[in-house]
Interface confidence: low
């Protein structure tokens, strides 16, 4: 049994920031779950992770240099991405895994959202050039 995910087909980030809402056919209330956002047709870059545990505060992090925040709804997770670069325009996929209670569940691959970063051309620092194009 797989969780279904709905995403908007295309979002335009005018000021290098965008809210991407991942809507699930599953209620996350009182569940331990890991929601993530992935960049590229091959989902090679894990952009942001929202980890929820009914007994702890929501954890939001990125291990790939993205500036992200996350908000939880009963059947949705919204990722707020900031400081996006124009060359990070790509297709982004929502993923969800429910670890507890059993059984472990994950989602059918969603159809993805094209995020078109249309805002100012931010210049990546030489020390951290930002995630590369796939």
């Amino acid at each position: 049994n797989k969780i279904l995910v709905k995403q908007s087909p295309m979002l335009v980030a005018y000021d290098n920031a965008v809210n991407l809402s991942c809507k699930y056919s599953y209620n996350l209330f009182s569940r331990e779950f890991r929601a993530s956002l992935h960049k590229g047709l091959d989902s090679a870059v894990e952009v942001c992770v929202v980890y929820g545990n009914y007994s702890q505060q929501l954890q939001v992090y990125s291990k790939t240099g993205f500036n992200c925040d996350g908000k939880l709804g009963n059947e949705s997770v919204t990722f707020y991405l900031q400081n996006l670069y124009v060359n990070q325009t790509d297709i982004y996929f929502c993923k969800i895994e429910v670890m507890y209670p059993p059984p472990y569940l994950d989602n059918e691959k969603s159809n993805g959202t094209i995020i078109h970063v249309k805002g100012k051309h931010l210049c990546p620092s030489p020390l951290f050039p930002g995630p590369s194009k796939p």
Epitope: K6, Q7, P9, M10, V12, N111, G112
Partner: nanobody, 117 residues
């Protein structure tokens, strides 16, 4: 079910032009976004151009100024006018359309574009 019919691919010389078209038919509720991807041999599929229902447009840097995406909402058709073609534009070009209220992407079968030098 939705059908996408792509046409316009072919073999051209560098510097020449081609116009791809993709017509969507079937159980179309509303078309939100229409896009073109391409995949060259041994490469990942790449987003080339996209246009949404209010005609906001995206182009990959590699095609800016050479390719133009447009859509005919009445005919539920998307076009890709490709000018000043280069050998590196050689790829299979896929039409990608979001045609339902469920935010579901449909992919065409692809049309081959070959640019010889």
């Amino acid at each position: 079910e939705v059908q996408l019919v792509e046409s316009g691919g072919g073999l051209v010389q560098a510097g020449e032009s081609l116009r791809l078209s993709c017509a969507a038919s079937g159980s179309i509720a509303s078309i939100k976004t229409m896009a073109w991807y391409r995949q060259a041999p041994g490469s990942q599929r790449e987003l080339v151009a996209a246009i949404n229902y209010i005609k906001e447009i995206y182009y990959a840097d590699s095609v800016k100024g050479r390719f133009t995406i447009s859509r005919d909402n009445a005919k539920t058709t998307v076009y890709l006018q490709m000018n000043s073609l280069r050998p590196e534009d050689t790829a299979v070009y896929y039409c990608v359309v979001d045609v339902t209220k469920e935010d579901y992407w449909y992919w065409g079968q692809g049309t081959q574009v070959t640019v010889s030098s």
